[in-house]
């Protein structure tokens, strides 16, 4: 089923951008907002 | 670019006691500063940050006890009811930035604080 | 509140060889983490940040890898200055309480 694990990667994904978000308001930024691939 | 912390002495259990850190060659609108502590013999032990918003945040065991401030150059931590437990070296450092690098993160060489009758 | 598992507490290695250093999250931090090495008498030195970037001056046998709540750090060709002890750090956002972190216990490593 992988629309199953490919919808838990991509909310997983979301989740990860919002606390990117959140500790940028707290660290600052360095350089305007880009997306790491691992 | 630097940070110093300094304040650290012998206090009797209950003395409030400010630690003050530092800075020098940055601005602290641009850094978050956190306070990190570390008893003799045992590990390192997170007690909070000021981000750049200036919003504070704390671990759950320092809450209520400890509190971070900041002026221009300075970021203070106020510590009350002390107790021989908090007996540590205190940790000044600087946060990497969000998107920023490895040179962002600054240590000081810590503060003594001793807690004893 | 964020909370960091360290294992092993302490490891022995021999010169060229290889170390490996666990630090399990009790949440998942994505690739929130940091690896530290301090020596007696220091501040921590930052080795690596975002679970696998490597701190600029640190040499490339220490390698960072992990995301979620498992991560690992991983020091091949062991040399006596690696003698040490390594800490974990993780960062977590929680909606209740906002920004947290927290070290593992640490884990000393002994060069023979």
């Known amino acids: 089923h992988s629309d199953g694990i490919f919808t838990d990667s991509y909310s997983r994904y979301r989740k990860q951008m919002a606390v990117k978000k959140y500790l940028a308001a707290v660290l600052g930024k360095r350089y305007k907002q880009r997306v790491k691939n691992k | 670019q630097s940070v110093e912390e300094s304040g650290g002495r012998l206090v009797t259990p209950g003395t409030p006691l400010t630690l003050t850190c530092t800075v020098s060659?940055?601005?602290?609108?641009?850094?978050?500063m956190s306070w990190v502590r570390q008893a003799p013999g045992k590990g390192l032990e997170w007690i909070g940050i000021m981000g750049v918003n200036d919003i504070t945040y704390y671990a759950s065991w320092a809450k209520g006890r400890f509190t971070i401030s900041k002026t221009s150059t300075t970021v203070d931590l106020k510590m009350t009811s002390l107790t021989t437990e908090d007996t540590a070296t205190y940790f000044c450092?600087?946060?990497?930035?969000?998107?920023?690098?490895?040179?962002?993160?600054?240590w000081g060489p810590g503060t003594l604080v001793t807690v004893s009758s | 509140a964020i909370k960091m598992t360290q294992t092993p507490s302490s490891v022995s290695a021999a010169v060229g060889g290889t170390v490996t250093i666990n630090c399990q999250a009790s949440e998942d931090i994505y690739t929130n983490l940091a690896w530290y090495q301090q020596k007696p008498g220091q501040p921590p030195n930052l080795l690596i940040y975002d679970a696998s970037d490597l701190a600029s001056g640190v040499p490339s046998r220490f390698s960072g890898s992990g995301d979620g709540t498992q991560f690992t750090l991983t020091i091949s060709a062991v040399q006596c200055e690696d003698a040490a002890t390594y800490y974990c750090q993780g960062v977590a956002w929680s909606s209740n309480t906002g920004y947290g972190s927290a070290f593992g216990g640490g884990t000393e490593v002994v060069v023979k």
């Open positions: 450092t600087r946060e990497i930035r969000d998107d920023g690098d490895s040179s962002d993160k600054l």
């Open positions: 060659g940055f601005s602290l609108n641009n850094y978050a």
